[in-house]
Structures are given as C-alpha cells and as structure tokens.
C-alpha cells in the first residue's frame, strides 16, 4: 500500500505565439481545480476507462479575476498535493490523465458552472520511494508544470511497496535471516512469504510461495530483464543474478531537454519530446521553418513560412511526435480484440483473427454479429442468437446511431448538477455532499444532509430520494 502524490507547480500560457485568452473575466470570476486519474501499465486506454489505480480531485484554487488588457498570467492554484492512495503493489509503470477544470462564479442560476479547460495524458515509469519527478505537459496553448512521486505507507517498503517492515522484537538485532528495513533502521523486514529467491526489487507476491514480476522483468524469480540488452537501466552495470544495479542519477535528472522539452527515460538513455519550433536530441535546434524540412518519416509540413511562426507536422500512419520522429508501436496498444494477433506492417496494421471472429480489429463475432455493424465506435456483442451493440460513451440505440445524453439518467444524487463532456460526465455537488455522483452526505445528521430521514427511521432502513 502507498500513496501517489501530485504537486501542480503552474498552469498558464505555454511558450510561443497564440497565447490563450484568460479563462476568467471581471464579469465572470473563476477558480481552478484539478483532477488526476491513474491507470496501471503503459497501455493507452480510452479516456473513459476506469481509473484502476485511483483518482483524486484537488481543492478549489483562489478566485481569479482578469485584469483588462493584461496577458493571461499563470493562474492561481489550489493549495496542497493531490493524493491517490493505492492498496496493492505499485506497478512501476503507469498512465496518467490530469484535467484542469474551471469553476465560474458569476451569477449562474443554480450555482457555479464547470468546464474543462485542458487535459494532458502520459505514460511513465516510476519506482516507489524515489525522489520527485518533474514534468511539463502542453494542451493546446496551455502549459502545465507538475511533479509527482509514489511513496509506500508503513509497513510496506521497496520500489513496489511489496516488502513489509515490522517493529523489532528485540532491541539489538533482527531475527535470523531478516535484514533491517532501510531507511527505518529500527524496524526489521517481515519474514518473506514469496517463493524462495524471488527478487526483492523486481518481484512481489500476493500469496505465499508465488513470485510475480514487475513490468520489465521476467523469469521464475524475476531476475531476468525483458530487454535483450544486458541492462534495462542506463544507470549502472549489468549483474548476472539481479539484472541491473541502479546506483547514481537517472538520465532525466536535471532535465537535459532544452526549450521546455519534456524528458522520458528509455531502456538505453533518454528521449526528449520537444515543443513546436524545436527539435534535435535535446530540443536545442530552434528557429525552424518548413524550408528546413523538420518533418521526418514522410511527414507533411504546414505553415511556418518565417522563423516567428510555428510549423506543424502532419505525420503518416505509424509515426508521431512534433516532428514525426517517433515510430508508434501500435501493437503495444493491443488493438486486436478477441485474442487476435497484431501485425504492424509499417504502412498498415493488420489483425489476424481467431476462428469465429472477423473485422479490421477482430471486433465482430461471426455467429451473431455477421453483417451487422455498430456505429460511432460501438462494439457488437453476441447473445442468444441476436446481435446487440455495446455503445461508446455518448451514444445509444440499437446500432449506436442515436446521440445519448449522459446526464439524461439524472446520475448526480442529492441535487447535484450534471455536466457532460467528452470523457463522460461530472457532477457538481450541492454543499454538504461529496463523491463522483454526490452520493455521500458529509454530515448525514446535520442540516446540510437534505432531505432529512423521516421520523422514526432506524439504521438499516432505507431512505428514498426522488
């Protein structure tokens, strides 16, 4: 068990031309708040898939009113960290979504209005117990600067929070075969229940006798790096028994990427994701126009006739990045459904389907779904000889052709107001209520918990709200 912590440093206009308009005005003062959603692994999941590692909402920031004629500055932020507790092992690799929300405080009928200002997402490797990692992400003309870390909650320790520490039974030393728990030298490692020899750094167990590997490691004792190179990490020499030692600083420490580039570690070194107008290994090359041919791998360059205006690379299938410099490992996103085998042919993606399934992504069950298609990203589900569409968020009807209002079912309880946006819905709770759907009265016996229970209601009896 442990806690993922996110510290927002600044949210404001990014570098370059086209500064965004201030989200607040004298007529409509507003304040910001943030939502973070965490998912395990490196899969690029849909925005509406559950935040399996957890989610958190920040407090509201200070009220901000734009000064007329002034450029949009960095906006005032909420105090404190966003904390996402996790109950099981820290996965080591994770995906995140950070949303910046605006709460307008004008004279709206029915209370404040919410709107999504910016949304950034990424995938990272992170060991629990390590230092704060710094990051910069851009969404349109906005820039978000933040730091994050994962830390274990006692008695858990280790890079995955899977080793346990217990107070010493004897004051002088730990029991036979048990080591002191750094940095808690006054505590001892709990007796190991994993399979004998299971790597304490790269393996963990949830049942006695098993040895499950963290991402990037394999073998019965999780001592073999998945990478064919001798060492997964660029930080230290290879070791025959443990895979890699991890002393010294990481390649992204001190952020080697210039001009606002963001750094991510790779198995051998580091990689910079550069803002528009910059490229090179460390984003050090600037003043680029389309005449310089900045788009790689057949990317089409648009705009940027003079050094002051940004260019945009339109990448061909299979490539991404501001300069089309990154090859997309499209099979890592597991696009083939129903156990289909993914083949990345470079120019195209192919799915080799298992018997009984068909379609570009093996999404059609030939039994019930033959010849039937679900519109708007819906998937066909077989059932009792009749086809049924499981529709993507925001669509409904037999073939997912009808636009559905996610707020139509009145999902927000206790008088909460529902707001629809592209990644689902958000409930703005009435004062005194909390939760994704305002399900939780903060003080159910107090005046704010309306409606009150009828007289004589005992614990265990239902209270009905229409």
């Amino acid at each position: 068990a442990g806690v993922f912590e996110l510290q927002i440093h600044s949210f404001g206009p990014g570098p370059g031309p086209g500064a965004p308009r201030s989200p607040c005005s004298a007529r409509l003062p507003c304040r910001l708040f943030f939502r973070v959603c965490l998912k395990p692994g490196l899969s690029e999941e849909a925005a509406e898939s559950p935040c399996a590692l957890g989610a958190a909402l920040s407090a509201r920031g200070p009220v901000y009113t734009e000064q007329p004629g002034a450029p949009a500055p960095d906006l005032p932020l909420p105090d404190g960290l966003l904390q996402v507790p996790f109950r099981d092992a820290w996965p080591g690799t994770f995906s995140f979504i950070i949303e910046t929300w605006r709460e307008e405080l004008g004279d709206q009928i029915g209370g404040p209005a919410w709107s999504l200002l910016a949304r950034v997402a990424g995938r990272r490797r992170l060991a629990a117990g390590g230092p704060w990692a710094r990051d910069i992400q851009r969404a349109g003309a906005w820039e978000l600067r933040f730091s994050y870390r994962a830390r274990c909650e006692p008695p858990a320790v280790g890079t995955a929070c899977t080793r346990l520490c217990r107070p010493r039974s004897a004051p002088s030393r730990c029991g036979p075969g048990l080591r002191p728990c750094a940095p808690l030298e006054d505590e001892c490692e709990a007796p190991l229940v994993c399979r004998a020899g299971c790597s304490p750094e790269h393996g963990f167990c949830e049942q006695p006798g098993e040895c499950r590997c963290l991402e990037g490691w394999t073998g019965p004792l999780c001592t073999v790096p998945v990478s064919t190179s001798s060492c997964l990490s660029p930080r230290g020499p290879s070791s025959a028994t443990t895979g890699c030692l991890v002393p010294g600083p990481g390649p992204c420490d001190g952020n080697p990427c210039a001009n606002g580039g963001s750094c991510s570690e790779t198995p051998r070194s580091f990689e910079c994701t550069c803002p528009r107008g910059f490229y090179g290994l460390r984003c050090e090359v600037s003043g680029v126009t389309c005449a310089d041919g900045p788009c790689f791998n057949g990317g089409l360059c648009v705009g940027g006739a003079d050094p002051d205006s940004a260019y945009i690379c339109h990448c061909p299938p299979g490539f991404q990045g501001s300069n089309c410099e990154k090859r997309v490992d499209r099979c890592s996103l597991q696009p083939c459904r129903n156990g289909g085998l993914c083949l990345d042919l470079g120019h195209a993606l192919r799915c080799r389907c298992r018997a009984g399934f068909a379609g570009p992504r093996c999404e059609h069950d030939l039994d019930d779904c033959a010849g039937r298609a679900c519109a708007n990203g819906g998937t066909c589900v077989e059932g009792g000889g009749a086809h049924r569409c499981s529709c993507a968020l925001g669509f409904g009807g037999r073939d997912c052709r009808e636009r559905a209002d996610p707020c139509a079912a009145r999902p927000c309880a206790h008088g909460g107001r529902c707001y629809a946006h592209f990644s689902g819905l958000v409930c703005a709770c009435a004062p005194g209520y909390m939760g994704a759907r305002c399900e939780f009265p903060v003080h159910p016996d107090g005046a704010s918990a309306l409606p009150a229970a009828p007289p004589g209601l005992r614990p265990g009896d239902p209270q009905r709200y229409l």
């Epitope: 935040c51 009896d461 209270q463």
Partner: nanobody, 119 residues
Framework: EVQLVESGGGLVQPGGSLTLSCVAS????????YGWYRRAPGKQRELVAG???????VYSDSVKGRFTISRDNAKNSVYLQMNSLRAEDTAVYYC?????????????WGQGTLVTVSS
C-alpha cells in the same frame, strides 16, 4: 431489501491497524456507492471515506493517507483499512450503501461497529 452487516471493530493501541468489513445482502444494484461514516462521542456522524461504482474514492482530510477504502463487487462487500490509528479515531463506524434504481435513489445504513483506540 438491503441489509448491511459490519465487522472488524475492536480495541487497538495508538499506531495500530484494523480492517473493517461490510457485507450488503438483499438485492444490491450495479449503480451504487459504499461509504464509511463514524460518530465519535458527543459529535455528529461524519463521512470517513466513500467509493463510487466507477471506483473513484473520497476521503475526509483527517484520514487521508492513513485509511484506504476498497470494494469487492463479487462479494457485495466494502472494506476500510485503517493504519496509524489515533485516539481521535475512536468512534462507532457505520457502513453506508447508496443505490439508484430507475431514477430513484435510496440509502441504507448498518448498525455500526465500535472502534476504540487506547493504550
């Protein structure tokens, strides 16, 4: 309809840990939320932690980082893992269940389980 049964309360020393469990029997629905509330002597009942049907969680400021709420949909159960307990955590802890069926919402409460933190 829906009955809630809590367990796991008891006497524990400061700094210790306890896990509370709550099982919902009857006819729980898939669109639901579970929560844990507590009432300390002489105070009104307050929210401790809650978990929605989409898995999102809320915690009161006083327990953040110490308590963890989780649920097991297959067992219609919710759990509250309480670590680093303090004397001020002493209270009767109530399980809360909230569900929506056909646009109508209902909430249910358990009978409560006593947690005493004392040396």
């Amino acid at each position: 309809e829906v009955q809630l049964v809590e367990s796991g309360g008891g006497l524990v020393q400061p700094g210790g840990s306890l896990t509370l469990s709550c099982v919902a029997s009857g006819s729980p629905s898939s669109i639901n939320a579970y929560g844990w509330y507590r009432r300390a002597p002489g105070k009104q009942r307050e929210l401790v932690a809650g978990i929605s049907s989409d898995g999102s969680k809320v915690y009161s400021d006083s327990v953040k980082g110490r308590f963890t709420i989780s649920r097991d949909n297959a067992k219609n159960s919710v759990y509250l893992q309480m670590n680093s307990l303090r004397a001020e955590d002493t209270a009767v802890y109530y399980c809360y269940y909230f569900r929506t069926v056909s646009g109508s919402s209902m909430s249910y409460w358990g009978q409560g389980t006593l947690v005493t933190v004392s040396s």
